[in-house]
Interface confidence: low
């Protein structure tokens, strides 16, 4: 929801966080801002206290309950506020209907590991981390490596259209430092976008054998 | 105390438009989403469409390319509008909201206003 | 959409007796409501979220029921409880609502 030179966004993890960040222009730094989420349908409502993350923006989490628990569904509609404290009262500076399962954006796949590793190729696996059990195999994965010399910028994205979570790395250089990182998206959702990068993963491919390329 | 009166309906021509009303009075249309439910005569209640607190909709997909649910929060009225009516539209149409959270149900009815559509 | 499937369509008892009316989802839903309707009236609420009675119910009104398959049920019918009942499911949009029950006095 955009008023003015306002802007509020918000993310549904698909389990029990709404990240949002609002940022305006010209706005005091100094004032007290917070997000109020009222579900339509549920017996609960929550605030977060927003905190700046730049000149212009601030951001905040609500916790909506256990980080596994299923707090909303596709039929929800959780109006989104942001007040601002003006001396003794309260005034809004932004609101938008949010449809969780409309504005998705999982965590980051957690639990990185090598399976197995050999002079060219690499096999590695992960875990989605609080993913709703209503997505079944609807999701999708991006992988990149990040080769010697290279920036994770410039390297190549591997897309997995379907709920795989390993990978098996090919043409890989032997005896070289790799590191890996993954991210996931579910299929579902107007605006969903793309979870952060997991955490690197480092490994290092075996050395060629001697008179041997294995 | 809760009230919700609809206005607009009346006979309406094959292929006109309709606008009904439904001005809400004890509670403010920025904090509860309206919904609209219609019946054909002595027929069951049908869904139609909802206008959420800050102003979003959800439609029935059978009627989304002809219904427009609107409102003005400063009249604290909600308006439905739905063209290319054809006879099979005729019914009394209802707005309606939920209690506190929708869990509670339709709650609070219209009285309802009856939409004629015959030439 | 999820159809809703009233069974049955209409039914005539006595003053007192029970009164049993089913609702069958055509795929599993969360939240069953239970309406009123008296002829020429809007529709009253009755049972929210499953089993919860609607504020100012009589409490010979009662409902059941999970994932497909849902009950109505009024204990001790009275002749004021001449109406037709639907059911509502709250699960997915388009929301929908049972063909109705009408229920008659012997």
């Known amino acids: 929801a955009v008023n003015g030179t306002s802007r509020f966004t918000c993310f549904y993890n698909s389990r029990a966080n709404i990240s949002c960040v609002w940022s305006q222009d010209g706005a005091l730094q100094d004032t007290s801002c917070q997000v109020h989420a009222w579900p339509d349908r549920r017996r609960w409502n929550q605030t977060c206290e927003l905190l700046p993350v730049s000149q212009a923006s601030w951001a905040c989490n609500l916790i909506l309950g256990t980080p596994d628990s299923q707090k909303l569904t596709a039929v929800d509609i959780v109006t989104l506020r942001v007040m601002c404290r003006e001396g003794v009262r309260w005034r809004m500076m932004a609101i938008q209907d949010f449809k969780p399962f409309e504005n998705l954006r999982l965590m980051a796949p957690i639990s990185l590991q090598v399976v197995h590793v050999e002079t060219h190729r690499c096999n590695i696996s992960w875990k989605i981390s609080q993913a709703s059990h209503y997505f079944e195999r609807h999701l999708e994965f991006e992988a990149r490596t990040l080769s010697p010399g290279h920036t994770w910028e410039e390297a190549p994205l591997m897309t997995l259209k379907q709920k795989q979570e390993w990978i098996c790395l090919e043409t890989l250089t032997p005896d070289t430092q790799y590191e890996f990182q993954v991210r996931v998206k579910p299929l579902q959702g107007e605006f969903t976008t793309w979870s952060p990068w997991s955490q690197p993963l480092a490994f290092r491919t075996k050395p060629a054998a001697l008179g041997k390329d294995t | 105390e809760v009230q919700l009166l609809e206005s607009g309906g009346g006979l309406v021509q094959p292929g006109g438009s309709l606008r009904l009303s439904c001005a809400a009075s004890g509670f403010s249309v920025t904090s509860y989403g309206v919904h609209w439910i219609r019946q054909a005569p002595g027929k069951g209640l049908e869904w139609l469409g909802v206008i959420w607190s800050g102003g979003s909709t959800d439609y029935n997909a059978a009627f989304i390319s002809r219904l427009t649910i609107s409102k003005d929060n400063s009249k604290n009225t909600v308006y439905f509008q739905m063209n290319s009516l054809r006879a099979e539209d005729t019914a009394v149409y209802y707005c309606?909201?939920?209690?506190?959270?929708?869990?509670?149900?339709?709650?609070?009815w219209g009285q309802g206003t009856l939409v004629t559509v015959s030439s | 959409d999820i159809q809703m499937t009233q069974s049955p369509s209409s039914l005539s008892a006595s003053v007192g007796d029970r009164v049993t009316i089913t609702c069958q989802a055509s795929?599993?839903?969360?939240?069953m409501y239970w309406y009123q309707q008296r002829p020429g009236k809007a529709p009253r609420l009755l049972i929210y979220d499953t089993s919860n009675l609607a504020s100012g119910v009589p409490s010979r009104f009662s409902g059941s029921g999970s994932g497909t398959s849902y009950t109505f049920t009024i204990s001790s019918l009275q002749p004021e409880d001449i109406a037709t009942y639907y059911c509502?499911?709250?699960?997915?949009?388009?929301?929908?609502f049972g063909q109705g029950t009408k229920v008659e006095i012997k």
């Open positions: 509502q499911q709250w699960s997915t949009y388009p929301l929908t």
């Open positions: 795929s599993s839903v969360s939240f």
């Open positions: 309606a909201r939920a209690g506190d959270y929708n869990y509670d149900g339709f709650a609070y």
